[in-house]
């Protein structure tokens, strides 16, 4: 089955720049199908833009302004790039690659879209560290000795663009667990986000991970917020607690506060 | 030009409660066209539900169906037994590929209609309130609550700053909250809330301790200073006299 | 302060065509989409066109489509609009007016936030 | 084309009164292409409202947009005797024309 993946979740450029998307196809070989762009404005319907056959034949809509966006494909990397030219307000919007994809029975056919990249423009050069800053609270003894649940809570402040995602994961799992977030919140001329992860009793000894997708993220990777394992009654930590690493390869600090 | 057009722009459903998403076509005969559903959840992601011809997307089958209203040019799509997963953006789209003769291979989309999942109605259930806390960052955890109308009020003579709370449906489809503010004096904060008529308190769920169960760290063993080497900790610390604060450096 | 200035407007004859201009200054108007909206005596605001900031996007009102064109000299901070086969129906108050610009957070909001005094148009014989 | 349609024609306030002004588009209007204008006589408009609830720069807090789909509203919370002019609701988004209501004027009464 094909897959499509937009490693960029947000492209951010100022006026008149260039703006190059990707979209990254496997579980088929993109020399032997189309790749298609759609775009979606706020409120708009998503609206076809080009695409790309098997052949590399380029066919645009009618409508779209000539010279403004270019397709192609890189087969080495099963890639395909939309570029977006001379980059103006009215090219703001989220950009989706898709391909129509086989189903075993003959003649049956959908079409799968990638998961988008918002193209953000601004009039300015953001120069300071607008990556997403976090924060983490740990659950309550309350909550732990009563519910037999524990809460753990992401706080992510400080960035831009608003685009961000966030999902957790138990330490050496690779599975997504169910997590209930906030809406994303302006705070001057940033955003912050919040999401929390209500996990049973026996696995609260288990490291659980905020994971945080953001294109400001150091080095273009995920930002892995570590979670330390608790004990009910009480919280040890081992040394590699202290040593816990995100995806950049960055010392995570645990800084632990006691009152009183 | 063709044209899909969604019949509503939002349809709240009930959780496990059926409900129905219509979108007609103008200009055209929907016969002459390839329906087709996708819903967009959260985060952007586009995923297939449904095309004519009896093909549904991974997980998709049991609890939706499609259909066509060749009489009336609209398209259907029921959801059998919604759940809080199925809240998102739904969109109609056609294509004429495989019909032959002049064919597109495009989709044309709608408008997106908005549903939104609230829990079915049930016996009112008293919230749980925990405070959780971090240097001047309190969260106040509302757990398990029905109806959804709730006030949260984070008790605090020195407020820095206060966030709206964040309402959402649980799994078990009751209401979950969290409300966030910074405060000076955060030690002190405490969180209280109106629900159904009644105020609920932070404290009601505090758990007594005996103080002398507790190990205090030395000063400085209060932060961890960056270091190539890790030491272990030497103390043992109680969950509810621990913040925990991860920074990247 | 930021300004729009118009000119160009004047008494013409159905049929007849004018060339309006618009002149920005303190700010760089190749930042900026810009519009056209006109308001005729004793009635409401209509939009007339708009040009994106690079003029790759140009879109006209029904009313005026064919027979108006919108440009903009970004090197001269100047916006026009070229009007031929004037009616009696276009006799108006011609504005030129700046859509807000894409910093800060609401980067992809849009509103008229500068306006020029506009410039009067009429069409009679 | 999407219609804007504002009511009422006329609202006849005294100052210190709050003016309720609504804008109805004849389909679903993105929030972030909903401005409203304030205009008096013999001067160019003024934008008031963006993105359907922000305020412009120097615009007063007594005026506040609300709304979203198709129904919105301008709210000036307490009349001064400046606020006695015509206003417009506009959506500048979806396809072209960037339609303009017909207006709203809020007079003395």
């Known amino acids: 089955a094909g897959h499509l993946e937009q490693p960029q979740i947000s492209s951010t450029k100022t006026l008149s720049k260039t703006a190059r998307l990707e979209c990254v196809v496997s579980g088929i070989t993109i020399s032997a199908t189309s790749v298609y762009w759609y775009r979606e404005r706020p409120g708009e319907v998503i609206q076809f833009l080009v695409s790309i056959s098997y052949d590399g034949t380029v066919r645009k809509e009618s409508g779209i302004p000539s010279g403004k966006f270019e397709v192609d494909r890189i087969p080495e990397t099963s890639t395909s790039t939309l570029t977006i030219h001379n980059v103006e307000k009215q090219d703001i919007a989220t950009y989706y690659c898709a391909l129509w994809e086989a189903q075993q029975e003959l003649g049956k056919k959908i079409k799968v879209f990638g998961p988008g990249t918002k193209l953000i423009i601004t009039d300015k050069q953001l120069d300071a560290d607008v990556s997403p800053k976090p924060t983490i609270f740990l659950p309550s003894i309350a909550e732990t000795k009563l519910q037999k649940a524990g809460t753990y809570l992401c706080l992510l402040e400080k960035f831009f663009p608003d685009v961000i995602k966030i999902h957790w994961q138990e330490k050496k799992s690779n599975t997504i667990l169910g997590s209930q977030e906030g809406n994303t919140m302006k705070t001057n001329d940033t955003y912050m986000k919040f999401s929390w992860l209500t996990v049973p009793e026996k696995s609260l000894d288990k490291e659980h991970r905020c994971i945080v997708r953001h294109e400001n993220n150091k080095n273009g990777v995920d930002q892995e917020i570590i979670f330390p394992p608790i004990k009910t009654d009480v919280i040890t930590m081992d040394p590699k607690d202290n040593c816990s690493k995100d995806a950049n390869d960055t010392l995570l600090l645990q800084l632990t506060n006691t009152s009183a | 030009a063709i044209e899909l057009v969604p019949e509503h722009q939002t349809v709240p459903v009930s959780i496990g409660v059926p409900a129905t998403l219509r979108c007609s076509m103008k200009g055209e005969a929907i016969g002459n066209y390839y329906i087709n559903w996708y819903r967009k959840t959260q985060g952007n992601t586009m995923t297939f539900i449904y095309r004519e011809k009896d093909i549904y997307g991974p997980g998709f089958k049991d609890n939706f169906q499609g259909d066509i209203d060749i009489a009336k040019n609209l398209a259907v799509l029921k959801i059998l037994a919604p759940s809080e997963r199925d809240e998102g953006s739904y969109y109609c789209a056609c294509d004429t590929l495989g019909m032959g003769g002049e064919y597109t291979d495009k989709l044309i989309f709608g408008k997106g209609t908005r549903v939104t999942v609230e829990p079915r109605s049930q016996p009112h259930t008293k919230p749980s309130v925990f405070v959780m806390k971090n240097g001047t960052n309190v969260a106040c955890l509302v757990k398990e609550f029905y109806p959804k109308d709730i006030r949260i009020n984070l008790v605090s003579s020195k407020k820095i700053t206060e966030f709206d709370p964040a309402i959402v449906i649980s799994p078990s489809g009751k209401y979950n909250a969290v409300k966030l503010g910074k405060y000076e004096d955060s030690n002190s904060v405490t969180c209280s809330v109106q629900h159904d008529n009644k105020t609920v308190h932070s404290t009601d769920f505090e758990v007594k301790t005996d103080s002398t169960d507790h190990v205090k760290p030395k000063e400085t063993e209060n932060t961890k200073q960056p270091s190539k080497s890790c030491h272990k900790p030497k103390a043992i610390v109680h969950t509810e006299k621990v913040n925990m604060m991860s920074l990247t450096v | 302060e930021v300004q729009l200035l118009e000119s160009g407007g004047g008494l013409v004859k159905p049929g007849g065509s004018l060339r309006l201009s618009c002149a920005a200054s303190r700010f760089t108007l190749s930042s900026y989409d810009m519009n056209w909206v006109r308001q005729a005596p004793g009635k409401g605001l209509e939009w007339v066109s708009s040009?994106?900031?690079?003029?790759?996007?140009?879109y006209y009102a029904d009313s005026v489509k064919g027979r108006f064109t919108i440009s903009r000299d970004n090197a001269k901070n100047s916006l026009y609009l070229q009007m031929n086969s004037l009616r009696a129906e276009d006799t108006a108050v011609y504005y030129c007016?700046?859509?807000?610009?894409?910093?800060?957070?609401?980067?992809?909001?849009?509103?008229?936030?500068?306006w020029g005094q506009g410039t009067t148009v009429t069409v009679s014989s | 084309e999407i219609v804007m349609t504002q009511s009422p024609g006329t609202l006849s306030l005294s100052p210190g009164e709050r003016a309720t002004l609504s804008c109805r588009a004849s389909?679903?209007?993105?929030?972030?292409?909903l401005a409203w204008y304030q205009q008096k006589p013999g001067q160019a408009p003024r934008l008031l409202i963006y993105g359907a609830s922000s305020r412009a720069t120097g615009i007063p807090d007594r005026f506040s947009g609300s709304g979203s789909g198709t129904d919105f509203t301008l709210t000036i919370s307490r009349l001064e005797p400046e606020d006695f002019a015509v206003y417009y609701c506009q959506q500048y988004g979806s396809s072209p024309p960037y339609t303009f209501g017909q207006g709203t004027k809020v007079e003395i009464k």
């Open positions: 007016a700046r859509d807000r610009g894409v910093g800060g957070t609401d980067y992809y909001y849009y509103g008229l936030d500068v």
């Open positions: 389909q679903s209007v993105s929030s972030s292409y």
């Open positions: 040009i994106s900031s690079s003029s790759s996007y140009i």
